[in-house]
């Protein structure tokens, strides 16, 4: 039995619905019945959505139950527990999850233009440095002129010397796209920020 936290973007975007997920694997087809119970701070709740078991390539079954949660319950550190009953288990299996403890610290966000040495290439790199945040759960994406971009890679959050975390995000764009003066925005979601969101933009200035 495995329990998974909600997606960071879902927790930090008020209009989305975060879900805690409980997954049971290696269920025998001879004894496929699995019953999920969910608890928030040890109070049972009945709002989970449990999917029909799915057959896996190794002929076992996999069963998934998702509990939609309130953003604040996760951010305020409540504990979510999934209890799984099955005839195949000698006793129910319980798995719990909650947000890491500690005081949230919002990141500082800095954008950096392509280095001039890179301007000989057909593709150039726009970089976003996100530093000083805690906990490490963060969502970083890029936009060009307000439109989401896909050609970027984020490093995993890495612990810094002060116990906070940092990451770098690199967006690849065609050199011409950069030189045309389009606006590139590094957009960051983190619980330590006002409304969980901040963004920093940059664009090419002629003569620079």
């Amino acid at each position: 039995v495995f329990i998974f936290p909600p997606k960071t973007k879902d927790v930090l975007t008020i209009t989305l619905t975060p879900k805690v997920t409980c997954v049971v694997v290696d269920i025998s087809q001879n004894d496929p019945e699995v019953r999920f119970s969910w608890f928030i701070d040890d109070v049972e709740v009945h709002t989970a959505q449990t999917h029909a078991p799915e057959k896996q390539s190794n002929s076992t079954l996999r069963s998934v139950s998702e509990l939609p949660i309130v953003h604040r319950d996760w951010l305020n550190g409540k504990t979510f527990k999934c209890k799984v009953n099955s005839g195949a288990f000698p006793a129910p299996i319980e798995k719990s999850i909650s947000k890491p403890e500690g005081t949230p610290r919002g990141p500082q966000v800095y954008t950096m233009a392509p280095p001039k040495e890179e301007m000989t290439q057909s593709q150039v790199s726009i970089t976003c440095m996100v530093k000083g945040f805690y906990p490490p759960d963060i969502y970083t994406e890029w936009k060009m002129n307000g439109q989401p971009q896909e050609n970027y890679k984020n490093t995993p959050p890495t612990m810094d010397t002060d116990g906070s975390y940092f990451l770098y995000s690199k967006l690849n764009v065609k050199k011409e796209t950069w030189q045309q003066g389009n606006t590139f925005t590094c957009s960051v979601l983190h619980e330590g920020l006002h409304n969980h969101h901040t963004e920093k933009s940059l664009s090419h200035s002629p003569g620079k």
């Epitope: 975007t13 008020i14 209009t15 619905t17 953003h71 604040r72 006002h194 409304n195 969980h196 969101h197």
Partner: antibody, heavy 117, light 107 residues
């Protein structure tokens, strides 16, 4: 730059309805709720409710449940509040406000509604 | 509904003076409290959220404190541009509710 642009003043007759638009720009419309607030001389500020533009879900202050209907047009990034069966008590300034996890970081400029025969 | 009682309802203060406005909730609101400033003919502007966090761009002379049912907004040294009406708002429970406002004027 985040902007919420509301329509100009409205003068309507008692018993009529009015639909107030709030045009959002400068952010991803579906990432934030849109709240609506009434400001009248008698009752200061009152929260009417909000709509989630992503899902269309609404939550209303029970006092406004039969008075206001909140909708959105995602294709044009406009939130609407319709007020019905208007009386002189509905005379007020109505604001839209972008609602994130922390309340109301950006507000519209307000729409003044006057109900008079 | 949670009732938010703000005091004083109006006050005069001198430039450079330290000013404190209070807001009392009818029940614990878990620090989900915001403070707004409104100038005549303008929309409210958020100053403080979650009881004590300053919104980016708001001068550091503004600060918020409190927990449970009792909260306060303090202006450490009053400036002319601070006059206006100040409102608190609880965001802990629906319906969200505002305090009645404090009108701050310069002596």
């Amino acid at each position: 730059e985040v902007q919420l642009l509301q329509s100009g003043p409205e003068l309507v007759k008692p018993g009529a309805s009015v639909k107030i638009p709030c045009k959002a720009s400068g952010y991803t419309f579906t990432d934030y709720n849109m709240d609506w607030v009434k400001q009248s001389h008698e009752k200061s500020l009152e929260w009417i409710g909000y709509i989630n533009p992503y899902s269309g879900d609404t939550i209303y202050n029970h006092k406004f449940k039969d008075k206001a209907t909140l909708t959105v047009d995602k294709s044009s990034n406009i939130a609407y509040m319709e007020l019905r069966s208007l009386t002189s008590e509905d005379t007020a300034v109505y604001y839209c406000a972008r609602g994130g996890y922390d309340y109301g970081d950006h507000w519209g400029q307000g729409t003044t509604l006057t109900v008079s025969s | 509904d949670i009732k938010m009682t703000q005091s004083p309802s109006s006050m005069y203060a001198s430039l450079g003076e330290r000013v404190t406005i209070t807001c009392k909730a009818s029940q614990d609101i878990n620090s989900y409290l915001s403070w707004f400033q409104q100038k005549p003919g303008k929309s409210p502007k958020t100053l403080i959220y979650r009881a004590n966090r300053l919104v980016d761009g708001v001068p550091s002379r503004f600060s918020g404190s409190g927990s449970g049912q009792d909260y306060s907004l303090t202006i450490s040294s009053l400036e002319y541009e601070d006059m206006g009406i100040y409102y608190c708002l609880q965001d802990d429970e629906f319906p969200r509710t505002f305090g009645g406002g404090t009108k701050l004027e310069i002596k």
